[in-house]
Amino acid sequence: MALPTARPLLGSCGTPALGSLLFLLFSLGWVQPSRTLAGETGQEAAPLDGVLANPPNISSLSPRQLLGFPCAEVSGLSTERVRELAVALAQKNVKLSTEQLRCLAHRLSEPPEDLDALPLDLLLFLNPDAFSGPQACTRFFSRITKANVDLLPRGAPERQRLLPAALACWGVRGSLLSEADVRALGGLACDLPGRFVAESAEVLLPRLVSCPGPLDQDQQEAARAALQGGGPPYGPPSTWSVSTMDALRGLLPVLGQPIIRSIPQGIVAAWRQRSSRDPSWRQPERTILRPRFRREVEKTACPSGKKAREIDESLIFYKKWELEACVDAALLATQMDRVNAIPFTYEQLDVLKHKLDELYPQGYPESVIQHLGYLFLKMSPEDIRKWNVTSLETLKALLEVNKGHEMSPQVATLIDRFVKGRGQLDKDTLDTLTAFYPGYLCSLSPEELSSVPPSSIWAVRPQDLDTCDPRQLDVLYPKARLAFQNMNGSEYFVKIQSFLGGAPTEDLKALSQQNVSMDLATFMKLRTDAVLPLTVAEVQKLLGPHVEGLKAEERHRPVRDWILRQRQDDLDTLGLGLQGGIPNGYLVLDLSMQEALSGTPCLLGPGPVLTVLALLLASTLA
């Protein structure tokens, strides 16, 4: 029997299906002659009088005619009709208002498969969590990149949920971005918090230049610090040229006087002269660059009475040069625990770090490291590689500082140093790491995971394995099996359940004999190659009452592939209406080469089977 294939909702471009869809829209009153959204979109809804007389072909309708629809009337449409409407609007490139887009999105109840056919900006209003899995999310965010993110204000919940989901999808760990990452984020790159700007200035600053809205305080501080630091791509302000100033155009409002004073005076004067002739330059950017360039005399000696005797709140009011001149590095090192309690600015922290670097050029001692507090966030991976961290207390103290954030390159380096120092990932360390970073285990390579002793597996919680791929579970499953081997049936299943994505067929067969009632979510995470050899009876026993859930998953792996391997007769015994099994009278030839190429078994119909039987009979008689 033929497998059912999904019929496209609409025929190929401009087919009668679209005409009848529009006829339906008109008759439902979705496209209304008098409604106009000119204020929102710059388009005007055209009158549709007479259009209803002849069901129109979509190509004969202008975008203006499709423009106005009130949200209230969408609720009367089925999900399928809403999707058809969305596709029609996309094909005619109709610009919709935020409200219309939100309204359509709410009515698309399940994650649409045909993302490419939907209006680009509609995707902004869909929940990114619905596109989990590397392929689905990649397709989703590749489209989002091209959408106009600025339809949504920065504070809008729909916009706020996009960035974390995009970073997770593109596999960004910590705050270090590549050029490709920034490209992949599209307009969402403008929402990246300051720590990304600090870590990835080289690739991110050129992107921030063209962000439409103003940067927030956090981004501004980080951009200012990066530009003042003089790293790539712009180099030290003292070397900037007029073309650098042009390139920095969108970031000029964040520069601040210390940077401006470092730019050669002639360059600023030339740039100001030219930009004053060019009306495209906005006023705020010019007013920042006042002709005020007398460099202050270098101040190096500590003013009398300002020498710091202890690290306390009075230092908040010190200028950077005063901190540099008046705070003794040894005093700082012995009172590091106080720094954490005092609200210094980022710029002041830079000075304090610089003092510690001068005192300990070979790397900080653990007594200082343990009390770094949020100064740890100022450390680079290079700084951390010089450290020798042996105490779990120190590790915990520093992880606490980064709590609630993604794992940064600093944290990754710190953990690496710590684990290498210990020689293996013992239970206490794993306990600590997974408490702070539930996804930590899944960030390790299969090779690194092989050094995890089975005893440590007891520290692993189900959520710690959420992002593990099959290769990682292949390594972890045997360890878990060993760790939990002395538990009885039901207790064993509870513990082993989250590791089963690495289980072989024989273990699944064994579990099917133990009345475990595996839930569908666990079943869907099993290795396809481990599920395929299971019989219908084994799957029924394995799932118990959850077997009914197979129907809802029949188009998804591994259920789809498993169905293809079963005899339709056997599937029918489940009474679930599963379709796509091997019909009666067909012979399955497991031609591994053919299957490797096509991904499906080779089926021979009754004719060839009779031929094969005749040949077998003849050879027997001979």
Epitope: E221, N340, A341, P343, F344, Y346, L349, Y374
Partner: nanobody, 119 residues
Framework: QVQLVESGGGTVQAGGSLKLACAAS????????MGWFRQAPGKEREGVAI????????YYRDSVKGRATISQDNAKKSVSLQMNSLRPEDTAIYYC????????????WGQGTQVTVSS
């Protein structure tokens, strides 16, 4: 969404007084320090005064000691800065700031209010 909104800025004669107010909304319950920073044209941003909201302890920069008073109204999650005997060098944009305990640099900043002292 945390918002700090400053008010009370303006132009005043040297020797005059001004009271800046900062209304906070959306601050986490755990925040424990509020304060005022300022930035004059062409100068580094600098702290003016801070107050620990839990203990009421206050700290001032040397140049405003005796002339400035920072105070809080816990019920309204607001903080004010009374500035007396104003000098031309007090001319700056004044920013309200807030922070949670041990959380790193000032996390929350207002948009700023301009104070101009004319001689």
């Amino acid at each position: 969404q945390v918002q700090l909104v400053e008010s009370g800025g303006g132009t005043v004669q040297a020797g005059g007084s001004l009271k800046l107010a900062c209304a906070a909304s959306g601050l986490p319950r755990t925040y424990n320090v509020m304060g005022w920073f300022r930035q004059a044209p062409g100068k580094e941003r600098e702290g003016v005064a801070i107050i620990y909201t839990t203990t009421g302890a206050t700290y001032y920069r040397d140049s405003v000691k005796g002339r400035a008073t920072i105070s809080q109204d816990n019920a309204k999650k607001s903080v004010s800065l009374q500035m007396n005997s104003l000098r031309p060098e007090d001319t700056a944009i004044y920013y309200c700031v807030a922070r949670q305990p041990n959380s790193g640099p000032w996390e929350y900043w207002g948009q700023g209010t301009q104070v101009t002292v004319s001689s």
